[in-house]
Interface confidence: low
């Protein structure tokens, strides 16, 4: 039975040209995390694999940085980066857990970050 839950940064906003950290946290399970995928709609952004480490998709290499932890840092944000992001935890033996984050990239300087996880 899948007992785990995923906590995410929820709905967040950031300024155009800036950076944002996407973070998810899997709790309430003893399952082993074998891999975490970060995806935007149907595009794969990055993977953190327990054996092979981080892999950033070639088309995002210049704007995506691994970490902190199992999170993902998006840099040089554009308005086109607005949308849904998913963290997909592949675990053994539980199976797959998915978390959702909605990012809004704003033109102005009034962007507020979500309360759960903040960029220092």
């Amino acid at each position: 039975m899948m007992t785990g839950t995923i906590e995410t940064t929820g709905n967040i906003s950031a300024e155009k040209g800036g950076s944002i950290i996407l973070q998810c946290h899997l709790s309430s399970t003893t399952a082993q995390v074998t891999q975490v995928n970060w995806e935007q709609q149907d595009q794969l952004l990055a993977i953190c694999n327990a054996d092979l480490g981080w892999h950033i998709s070639p088309s995002f290499k210049d704007r995506v940085a691994p970490g902190p932890g199992l999170g993902l840092t998006l840099q040089s944000l554009t308005v086109n980066d607005t949308g849904e992001y998913f963290c997909i935890y592949h675990t053994y033996p539980d199976g797959t857990y998915t978390g959702r984050i909605f990012l809004e990239v704003l033109e102005s300087s009034v962007a507020e970050h979500g309360a759960r996880f903040q960029i220092p």
Epitope: Q35, N37, D42, L44, I47, A50, H90, P93, G95
Partner: antibody, heavy 121, light 111 residues
Amino acid sequence: EVQLVETGGGLIQPGRSLRLSCAASGFTFSSYAMHWVRQAPGKGLEWVAVISYAGEVKYYADSVKGRFTISRDNSKNTLYLQMNSLRAEDTAVYYCARDPLPLHYYGMDVWGQGTTVTVSS
Amino acid sequence: QSALTQPRSASGNPGQRVTISCSGSSSNMGRRPVNWYQQIPGTAPKLLIYSQNQRPSGVPDRFSGSQSGTSASLTISGLQSEDEAEYFCAVWDDIGRVLQLGGGTQLAVLG
């Protein structure tokens, strides 16, 4: 509909080369690792090779290492298997298959219908 | 010689329960979840069980998997004639960096 279609099989003489192709459709090909698996006549399944979603990580079965090369062209949604120095024991139906994950080799969740390679003089 | 060991054959009557075993080693089954594939003669294999005990959509709940230590098993309850096929277990080997496949078990449905 998620689909894999293999082509390129045929009758070939020992020592020659052959390239198999696998055309993918119905899913985001560039997000998945891909495998080649073969099955000799009347025998079980034998894993041949795997390639990661972006093509930078590849692993091979000992029986084909140094002779076969797995590659992919994500812009064409196509997987390849270049087979050199073919031997009679390479005679088999060759299947391409999708891995549910991009890097962590879990297994194969979608299979093609297979293409037959016969190595004989 | 396969790195994963399966019985060559198994059989049962319609409605019966049949279990197929698969044994491996600490470098594969001791570290990774096993998958099971079904192959009906003349057709491509089909994923039956993944991540030890998960069923893809469309696979009847008559099929179940379990795994403990370096061995795994596939159980088919309420056997049906269409279950007559060959069954393969498979697991990624972390040490050799290869996908190991069992030799296959031919299941015959009697009667």
